[in-house]
């Protein structure tokens, strides 16, 4: 058993049929010695009496808010949550496996630049009685500070018969140098509590590996005289690290017909302009990627040809 | 340790092209190592991230762009020097700061070159003949060092009398390649910045 926060405790349980469970000692936070009784949750059923109570915890019915009273007055509370371990593996019932980039990916994180700011998100089908708390650090043995905000519900989607909820959190490394060469990864830890079930999820990464620039901005077309060709121009996204001559991007320019089946023409360039043939009803899209370290491409920025 | 004396090439900036070749070569070599050594811990998640140049050179700090010198977090490790003005272009008056930056890059390359050559000598003794260093990568390191045009004492290649542990050597190769790729990215950024200056 360990304390998650004040008066909230997590009991780690080996989860198998007829498991004996764990013995947990609860102590009433009071100077009183006599006449103390204990109840669980809203039940008026008295569990026992005395300043300390030893309880056998073996299933969710044994978790909950234990309250000690004296003469009708509440003295203190202890909330017990369960963390299940089945066949040596901690349960992952609360979050959905996103399976990208690999199986057992519950947390996904992205950074728009090298400032040390990043966003992580996760998915669940649970809509109520759900809380998250996020901690992060650079390295684990001698951790350096990373500050995370509160997790918030960022999107709701319908998937077949199910509703899916996306939560996200923003974190910022306390002292980040955009030019630094990372040798210790960022660690992100998410505590998830659904009713009386506790689970924790972790992710470890280097900022350089989760970079995904915003799409290029101010995408414009300039027709070239007496030609089907156009000059496409764009700019670095505002959120990208500066100076741009140091943090350079490379770009992919794509001409895509109306039909998905039509052949796509693609050009790769380090410049912020390119000359392409603009077909009728086609659209021109541009995306960006770090020029020197191949992490993710940005989403496309698009303009119609006409 | 005496700093090498900078005598940058006049004419067009040759370093950018060589640094791009270097990044390509080390990335290809790393990919090859990851594929060939698939049953060894050779991915970024599996290896320990070591920097053989740590406390010996200060490339990141010495080559910091002027715009980042206002960032306290970039200045916390040493008395940092910055690229201020001038470039590796036609200017014969290379600033002292830039000379420091380029000499630091040169020292990095020299250290990695020695490590890779020593390692290759060991890998050539492996009866499995599983992996060797790409000669192209070694050549590209050499070309960039020549383009930087520093005069520096040659470091003797490390020789070892004991029987090499090939498993450890291959893991060390992965660690070195990962670290060198990261340094090659920094070098490329620096050269791109200098080219634009």
């Amino acid at each position: 058993i360990w304390e998650l926060k004040k008066d909230v405790y997590v009991v780690e349980l080996d989860w198998y049929p007829d498991a004996p469970g764990e013995m947990v000692v609860l102590t009433c936070d009071t100077p009183e010695e006599d006449g103390i009784t204990w109840t669980l949750d809203q039940s008026s059923e008295v569990l026992g009496s005395g300043k300390t109570l030893t309880i056998q915890v073996k299933e969710f019915g044994d978790a909950g808010q234990y309250t000690c009273h004296k003469g009708g007055e509440v003295l203190s509370h202890s909330l017990l949550l369960l963390h299940k371990k089945e066949d040596g593996i901690w349960s992952t019932d609360i979050l959905k496996d996103q399976k990208e980039p690999k199986n057992k990916t519950f947390l996904r994180c992205e950074a728009k630049n090298y400032s040390g700011r990043f966003t992580c998100w996760w998915l669940t089908t649970i809509s109520t009685d759900l809380t998250f708390s996020v901690k992060s650090s650079r390295g684990s043995s001698d951790p350096q500070g990373v500050t995370c905000g509160a997790a918030t519900l960022s999107a709701e989607r319908v998937r077949g018969d199910n509703k899916e909820y996306e939560y996200s959190v923003e974190c910022q490394e306390d002292s980040a140098c955009p030019a630094a060469e990372e040798s210790l990864p960022i660690e992100v830890m998410v505590d998830a509590v659904h009713k009386l079930k506790y689970e924790n999820y972790t992710s470890s990464f280097f900022i350089r590996d989760i970079i995904k620039p915003d799409p290029p901005k101010n995408l414009q077309l300039k027709p070239l005289k007496n030609s089907r060709q156009v000059e496409v121009s764009w700019e670095y996204p505002d959120t990208w690290s500066t100076p741009h001559s140091y943090f350079s991007l490379t770009f992919c320019v794509q001409v895509q017909g109306k039909s998905k089946r039509e052949k796509k023409d693609r050009v790769f360039t380090d410049k912020t302009s390119a000359t392409v043939i603009c077909r009728k009803n086609a659209s021109i899209s541009v995306r960006a990627q770090d020029r020197y370290y191949s992490s993710s491409w940005s989403e496309w920025a698009s303009v119609p040809c006409s | 340790r005496n700093l090498p004396v900078a005598t940058p090439d006049p004419g067009m900036f040759p370093c950018l092209h060589h640094s791009q070749n270097l990044l390509r070569a080390v990335s290809n070599m790393l990919q090859k190592a990851r594929q060939t050594l698939e049953f060894y811990p050779c991915t970024s998640e599996e290896i320990d991230h070591e920097d053989i140049t740590k406390d010996k050179t200060s490339t990141v700090e010495a080559c910091l762009p002027l715009e980042l010198t206002k960032n306290e977090s970039c200045l916390n490790s040493r008395e940092t020097s910055f690229i201020t003005n001038g470039s590796c272009l036609a200017s014969r008056k290379t600033s002292f700061m830039m000379a420091l930056c380029l000499s630091s890059i040169y020292e990095d390359l020299k250290m990695y070159q020695v490590e890779f050559k020593t390692m290759n000598a060991k890998l050539l003794m492996d009866p499995k003949r599983q992996i060797f260093l790409d000669q192209n990568m070694l050549a590209v390191i050499d070309e960039l060092m020549q383009a930087l045009n520093f005069n520096s004492e040659t470091v003797p290649q490390k020789s070892s009398l004991e029987e090499p542990d090939f498993y450890k050597t291959k893991i060390k190769l992965c660690i070195l390649l990962h670290a060198f790729r990261i340094r090659a990215v920094t070098i490329d950024r620096v050269m791109s910045y200098l080219n634009a200056s």
Partner: nanobody
Framework: EVQLVESGGGLVQPGGSLRLSCAAS????????MYWIRQAPGKGLEWVST???????IYGNSVAGRFTISRDNAKNMLYLQMNMLRPEDTALYYC????????RGQGTQVTVSS
């Protein structure tokens, strides 16, 4: 009519063991929290242990680690395994359907003495 009948008491030396049993009838045994309470000579009732319908036990400070409560819902039976007995465990032990012992059996005497 609710009936609770205790058995298994006796005289035992310090450090010894006893197993108390309680046969319940006249109510849906499996739905109830069940309790063992005791009364030492010249003293009031003292709660010893509780068992929830799911079989999870709860223990007072004086017996935790030495006593184990259990139940067999199919047989309507409640048990108390008492190990490492001490002289201060000497008391009349009751099986009860509430912590105050308002619905309890006749009790079974446990004496711990050398």
């Amino acid at each position: 009519e609710v009936q609770l009948v205790e058995s298994g008491g006796g005289l035992v030396q310090p450090g010894g063991s006893l197993r108390l049993s309680c046969a319940a009838s006249g109510f849906t045994f499996s739905s109830y929290y069940m309790y063992w309470i005791r009364q030492a000579p010249g003293k009031g009732l003292e709660w010893v242990s509780t068992i929830k319908p799911n079989g999870s036990g709860i223990y007072g400070n004086s017996v935790a680690g030495r006593f184990t409560i259990s139940r067999d819902n199919a047989k309507n039976m409640l048990y108390l395994q008492m190990n490492m007995l001490r002289p201060e465990d000497t008391a009349l032990y009751y099986c009860a359907r509430d912590v105050r012992g308002t619905v309890r059996g006749q009790g079974t005497q446990v004496t711990v003495s050398s």
